[in-house]
Structures are given as C-alpha cells and as structure tokens.
Interface confidence: low
C-alpha cells in the first residue's frame, strides 16, 4: 500500500493509473466503501462522502489513463485509506494528514517559550525535528518546546515530520518581540545634549502599548520614573514627564528620548519597559549614561566621570601632543600646578577611547592673584 503524507490546509493529489491510455470508468472510495468521486463518460460524478465539496480530479489527464483524486484544504480527519477502482483493479493509497501549530501567537516576547504542537491521525507515530533560523535543532514527538526565546530565533522555523520513511515539511514564521539591543551606554561631556534611542528588532503593521523609563541616578538613593508614554499605531504620546530632567520624546518610532544636557546628577542607569497590547510580559532595554567633567580650580586640574563604568576603565589627563601625565583606574584624576596649554581628559575602557574633554590652562601670570 502506497503511503502519502499531507499537510493540514494544503492540497494533495493521489494518483491512479490505468494500463490503457484512454478515458475509462474509475471510482475513488474511502475505507468505508463510500464513493468519493468517479466519472460517467466525460462527466465528473461525486458520491455522498464528507469530502464532497473539497474533492476533485483532473479531467485533462483522463485521456492519458490518469485518474487522480485531488483533496483541497486537508483536514486531519481526511487521513484514511483511499481506493481507486479502475479496469477491475483496486489501487490503495494511505493518506496521513499532519498539522503543526504554534502554541499561541507566533509573535512572542524575548524570553518567552515557544511550543509547537503536532496534530496527527490516530495510530500514527511520527517523529518531528525542527530547525531554528540560527541552525539550532530540536526533536520531539507530539510537542516541542523552546524556552527563553532569543532575538536570533526570529524568522522561519523549518520542521520535518517523519512517518513510514516519508517526510513532510512545515515552515512556521516566528517573530520575537524585542529591542535591537538589550543594553546601551551613552558617553557625554557635561552640558552636552543626550540622545537615547530604543530601536525595535521587529516590524508589525500596528503597534499599540504603553511604556515607562525608570532611572537610577548614581548619586540618588532610589530610582524614579522619568517619563511614561503611550503608543498607538506607531504614534508616541507622552503621558507624564518629570520636571527634572525635562525629557523630550519623539512622536514616531523608533522610540527616541532627548535629555537637554548631561549633568553629573543624571549619570546612572535606566530601564525602559514597553508593554504591548494583547501580550503578557514586557520588553526591556537598559540604558546607561556616563558624564565627564574637566575643571580647573586654582592650582588643581581635575577630570571626573560619573555613571556605570566597567572594570577596565582608565581615566587619563594629558597635555596636547604629550604623553599622559596621569592615568588611573579611578573615576577622578588630577594634576597639581598644570603647565599652560590645552589639556585632554580621556576615558578609555578596555583600551577603547570612549570620551574626551579638552580644557585650556592659562599661564599662571594671566590668572588673578588670590587675596
């Protein structure tokens, strides 16, 4: 008996061939001997089966001795043995219809779980193997689960169902809802304008939800909400904003925030959360602000940084075109009685120069004498 695998919702074509290459009488029946379809001369006739409106054949092939049974919009319950009767012969074809569906929505939040469920006909014992867009393989029986979805899991999952040495392939498009970056860091000199951007890693027709940015300043004992906003069909509207700092927010995606000026009291870490309509859970992006200040007070030249910095941090003070005068793994460096000229304060992290601030030191004779 020939075995054919089909996919739920698809169309399948079961073949039946006569030895005579001409149109002769044929019938397709199911295992209960109920007629599905056949012919009467050059006319297609249908029986009382449940497939009535979904069954068809190709009249153009009858003259060549081919009498296919076409079943559209396959259902799991279409799994059966189909019998073609032609020239006093019976050809049996076993059709097994499988379906593969995602547990809920195919749009899932980063960190959530994806469960794929296989629908299969009674008596079948299929095995399933799925391959993620980044090449991760998972195997299972009736259900397959992937916990902690990552951004790289977005895309087309290809699943192969194996039964009786035959296979059928399913493709499921999964969208992982996340920000492009889990974390970002902005380095600014004191007084500069700060731009925070929160690009999303997915595109959808309509995007509705609400969000909030909580900020933990390095100098503050507790965190506070800097801004809350709504998102309606990709349009952003601010609900509430603190008076200090007075943040501004862009009206379109990507989510964009502007801090008028970087000040030491704002240096710290923020967490932007976005709750999407009809989704449980929230999207998160961490954002960090590091602020640098270079000052000269009497005979002391000081460079300081505030905000979250890594253990590879190096702060240096150097006179332009000369080697570093002082270089430390600290958040403040200083030079007593600095020479006149343009001094540079450099913040480097793991060797990467992240921030640079220049300060001009005037010759001592041009500085008013302190009383």
């Amino acid at each position: 008996k020939k075995v054919v695998l089909g996919k739920k919702g698809d169309t399948v074509e079961l073949t039946c061939t006569a030895s005579q290459k001409k149109s002769i009488q044929f019938h397709w029946k199911n295992s209960n001997q109920i007629k599905i379809l056949g012919n009467q001369g050059s006319f297609l006739t249908k029986g009382p089966s449940k497939l009535n409106d979904r069954a068809d054949s190709r009249r153009s092939l009858w003259d060549q001795g081919n009498f296919p049974l076409i079943i559209k919009n396959l259902k799991i319950e279409d799994s059966d043995t189909y019998i073609c009767e032609v020239e006093d012969q019976k050809e049996e074809v076993q059709l097994l219809v499988f379906g593969l569906t995602a547990n809920s929505d195919t749009h899932l939040l980063q960190g959530q779980s994806l469960t794929l469920t296989l629908e299969s006909p009674p008596g079948s014992s299929p095995s399933v193997q799925c391959r993620s867009p980044r090449g991760k393989n998972i195997q299972g029986g009736k259900t397959l689960s992937v916990s902690q979805l990552e951004l790289q899991d977005s895309g087309t999952w290809t699943c192969t169902v194996l039964q009786n040495q035959k296979k059928v392939e399913f493709k499921i498009d999964i969208v992982v809802l996340a920000f492009q970056k889990a974390s970002s860091i902005v380095y600014k000199k004191e007084g500069e304008q700060v731009e925070f951007s929160f690009p999303l890693a997915f595109t959808v027709e309509k995007l509705t939800g609400s969000g909030e940015l909580w900020w933990q300043a390095e100098r503050a004992s507790s965190s506070k909400s800097w801004i809350t906003f709504d998102l309606k069909n990709k349009e952003v509207s601010v609900k509430r904003v603190t008076q200090d700092p007075k943040l501004q927010m862009g009206k379109k995606l990507p989510l964009h925030l502007t801090l008028p000026q970087a000040l030491p009291q704002y240096a710290g870490s923020g967490n932007l959360t976005l709750a999407l309509e009809a989704k449980t859970g929230k999207l998160h992006q961490e954002v960090n602000l590091v602020v640098m200040r270079a000052t000269q007070l009497q005979k002391n030249l000081t460079c300081e940084v505030w905000g979250p910095t890594s253990p590879k941090l190096m702060l240096s003070l150097k006179l332009e075109n000369k080697e570093a005068k002082v270089s430390k793994r600290e958040k403040a460096v200083w030079v007593l009685n600095p020479e006149a000229g343009m001094w540079q304060c450099l913040l480097s992290d793991s060797g990467q120069v992240l921030l640079e601030s220049n300060i001009k030191v005037l010759p001592t004779w041009s500085t008013p004498v302190q009383p």
Epitope: P311, S316, K318, E323, A324, S327, K328, R329, Q344, L346, S348, S350, G351, Q352, V353, E356
Partner: antibody
Framework: QVQLVQSGAEVKKPGSSVKVSCKAS????????INWVRQAPGQGLEWMGV????????LYAQSFQGRVTITADESTSTAYMELSSLRSEDTAVYYC??????WGQGTLVTVSS | DIVMTQSPLSLPVTPGEPASISCRSS???????????LDWYLQKPGQSPQLLIY???NRASGVPDRFSGSGSGTDFTLKISRVEAEDVGVYYC?????????FGQGTKLEIK
C-alpha cells in the same frame, strides 16, 4: 580573526634608532589600545608603553621615557614603535599587543657594532 | 612600580598531574570596584605569549577549562588540573592596575 603583523628583523648600530611597525586587521583599529612589550634573549617580558589610536593618547614606562615614541596611523591601521639611542642591551624581540590579549609575532632587533 | 614575584621558577610535572604557580605583588591589585587587575600569560617555545586568565580568575576565550586562576589582593595562583604535553612553556603573571604594567619573572613548566 584578529591579526597583528609586525615588520621584519632589524640589525642596528649602537646610538641609532629603530622603527617597528605593527599592522592590525580583523577588528576596529581605533577601538583598542596597542601596547608594546619587549623580551631580551632568554629573559622575561618588559612593558614599554601604550597608545590609544583613537585619541592618540600615549603612556610610556619611566625606564624608556625620552627614548621611545609610539604612534598610530588610523588610515592604514598600523601602529609604530620607535626606539632611539640604541644600546646593546636593547637587543630583544619587540611585540605589539592589542589590548592585552592578541600578540603580534614579534620583531627581533639586534644592536651590535 | 609594582613588583611581581613568581614561584617556583621551574616546575617539572608528570602529564595528568596537577600543577600550581604562585604570583605575589608588592601592593594590592584589588581595585575598589572589586576586581583584581592580574592577568596570566603562557609563552610556548618559539611562540608569542597568549592570554590565559584576565582580572584574576576569568578564562580568556578558547582557553581549556583545566586552567583556573584564583586569589585576591597580593596573592594569586594559577592552577592546571591535569597537565598535558601541550602546556609546556613559560607562564607569566602581569599586573594591569597601575602603569607601568609589570610582569613576574616567569615560571618554566616542563614535562618530567
């Protein structure tokens, strides 16, 4: 992958200068320090100095102060170490190091009259 | 300058046996941020040094897990759980807390 390719071996006279080059590839050149470390024959490792190519900030070990100059050319992703007033005890293999993790193959400088 | 002192200077080991190298600094390498600024390097015969451990106890990428670093402040240890023939060479510790970075004098590991 990260590669640091150094210039070939040099033989120099005492009192002269040598300039060793280090061509970097496989990463963003301006994003990481280039350190220079030397090793005299059969001896240990000695740090000479460092440059941050993006800011051209340099820092030198006191023992080489005034004799060593480290520079970087962003356009060719190449760092240079020049050592002047050479003496016989400067005979060593000179290494360039990205950050402190990837090392060049080393350049042997021999100082001999 | 911070002075780094290693011991032993020579270490003969039987393959499959563990090995341990000690490194002492003349002042604490523990930064106020909680990290120890000490790195370990291996220089195999005829090769450039390679980074094994950074910030006291973090294995560099591609380094087998038989290598581990421990210690804090002024006393540090590099351990090899089971020595293999390919581990021969000179092991150096280096402090990266203050410039100039300074190295230990090196420990030569050889197979018995």
């Amino acid at each position: 992958q990260v590669q640091l390719v150094q210039s070939g071996a040099e033989v120099k006279k005492p009192g002269s200068s040598v300039k060793v080059s280090c061509k970097a590839s496989g990463y963003t050149f301006t994003s990481y320090d280039i350190n220079w470390v030397r090793q005299a024959p059969g001896q240990g490792l000695e740090w000479m100095g460092v440059i941050s190519p993006s800011g051209d900030a340099t820092l030198y070990a006191q023992s080489f102060q005034g004799r060593v100059t480290i520079t970087a050319d962003e356009s060719t992703s190449t760092a240079y170490m020049e050592l002047s007033s050479l003496r016989s005890e400067d005979t060593a293999v000179y290494y360039c190091v990205k950050g402190l993790d990837h090392w060049g193959q080393g350049t042997l400088v021999t100082v001999s009259s | 300058d911070i002075v780094m002192t290693q011991s032993p200077l020579s270490l003969p080991v039987t393959p499959g046996e563990p090995a341990s190298i000690s490194c002492r600094s003349s002042q604490s390498l523990l930064h106020s941020n909680g990290y120890n600024y000490l790195d370990w390097y291996l220089q195999k015969p005829g090769q450039s040094p390679q980074l094994l451990i950074y910030l006291g106890s973090n294995r560099a990428s591609g380094v087998p897990d038989r290598f581990s670093g421990s210690g804090s402040g002024t006393d540090f240890t590099l351990k090899i759980s089971r020595v293999e023939a390919e581990d021969v060479g000179v092991y150096y510790c280096m402090q990266a807390l203050q410039s100039p970075w300074t190295f230990g004098q090196g420990t030569k590991l050889e197979i018995k």
